[in-house]
């Protein structure tokens, strides 16, 4: 079986302040089972942006219906972007476990925020 890959097609995305940013991510397989999470930054201090499994993320919505059993599109949309949202975002696949085990990360998408047009 081909090894699962996590694909973030855009290296960078630029969005005007106040608008929404779409961060694209697809996986090449649903196996092994386990959730997808989005983070900003890397390492122990990385910030959780979205968790497929749980949590309340009022500014983040999945682009595709995550309840589809064959869904492999884990793209997200972040609303009302501010300069504080700038950074590199990573889509990370986990394998189920206690706790879940990080399996594969996308290459990252750098979000830059332009000043709001006057």
């Amino acid at each position: 079986e081909e090894e699962l890959q996590v694909i973030q097609p855009e290296k960078s995305v630029s969005v005007a302040a106040g608008e929404s940013a779409t961060l694209n991510c697809t996986a090449t397989s649903l196996i092994p089972v386990g959730p997808i999470q989005w983070f900003r930054g890397v390492g122990p201090g990385r910030e959780l942006i979205y968790h497929q499994k749980e949590g309340h993320f009022p500014r983040v919505t999945p682009v595709s219906d995550p309840t589809k059993r064959n869904n492999m599109d884990f793209s997200i949309r972040i609303s009302n972007i501010t300069p504080a949202d700038a950074g590199t975002y990573y889509c990370v696949k986990f394998r189920k476990g206690s706790p879940d085990v990080e399996l594969k990360s996308g290459a990252g998408t750098e979000l830059s925020v332009r000043a709001k047009p006057s």
Partner: antibody, heavy 118, light 107 residues
Framework: DVQLVESGGGVVRPGESLRLSCAAS????????MSWVRQAPGKGLEWLAG????????YYIDSVKGRFTISRDNSKSSLYLRMNSLTAEDTAVYYC???????????WGLGTLVTVSS | ALTQPASVSANPGETVKITCSGG??????YAWYQQKSPGSAPVTVI????ERPSDIPSRFSGSASGSAATLIITGVRVEDEAVYFC???????????FGAGTTLTVL
């Protein structure tokens, strides 16, 4: 509190049709996939069909494919199961169940009894 | 198909373990459903292998490894008498399956 209330069961003759309903309350119905599960007298649980939150994707066990149809109306927070060409083997209590993020079930209705008898 | 024992029994206060086998660890998530009488509404006591809903007592726990899942009831009580069904979701086939059920008798 999450509540799921099935209705539409009853006694029908072999070959007839029936439509079951499940009224949901206490949660955002349009955010959850849903399923139908049945239990024949003295038997175990049998999953029949599932539907994604948006209603575009449906899934069935092979034995009811083409004969049963799952659907939903998010504006009414309602789930449905249309059952055609019923046989005595379809006699069971039919439950609707809310799906977790990974397609297991976290809440169940009280069930509605369908009896197929001549 | 998921396989579980037909029955188990225990004295109050003992620890009960019910196993469920037959799923592939890498493609299957497990859950445990409690049914106190035939035809009554099942209650989910564990889902996602080891996650306990907030209204379920902490004496219920779950685990999964290899091709099996286990429901553990630590300090079993008389009110835990029920049939316990293991359930699985297979990410390869998109299908839900159930075991035949285990009748727990608390002596």
């Amino acid at each position: 509190d999450v509540q799921l209330v099935e209705s539409g069961g009853g006694v029908v003759r072999p070959g007839e049709s029936l439509r079951l309903s499940c009224a949901a309350s206490g949660f955002t119905f349009s955010s959850h996939a849903m399923s139908w599960v049945r239990q024949a007298p003295g038997k175990g649980l049998e999953w029949l069909a599932g539907i994604s939150a948006g209603g575009s994707d449906t899934y069935y066990i092979d034995s009811v494919k083409g004969r049963f149809t799952i659907s939903r109306d998010n504006s009414k927070s309602s789930l449905y199961l249309r059952m055609n060409s019923l046989t005595a083997e379809d006699t069971a209590v039919y439950y609707c169940a809310r799906e977790t993020w990974n397609h297991l079930f976290d809440y169940w209705g009280l069930g509605t009894l369908v009896t197929v008898s001549s | 198909a998921l396989t579980q024992p037909a029955s188990v029994s225990a004295n109050p206060g003992e620890t009960v373990k019910i196993t469920c086998s037959g799923g592939d660890y890498y493609s299957t998530y497990y859950a445990w459903y409690q049914q106190k009488s035939p035809g009554s509404a099942p209650v989910t006591v564990i889902h996602s292998d080891d996650e306990r809903p907030s209204d379920i007592p902490s004496r219920f726990s779950g685990s999964a490894s290899g091709s099996a899942a286990t429901l553990i009831i630590t300090g079993v009580r008389v009110e835990d008498e029920a049939v316990y069904f293991c359930g699985g979701y297979d990410g390869r086939t998109y299908i839900n399956t159930f075991g035949a059920g285990t009748t727990l008798t608390v002596l």
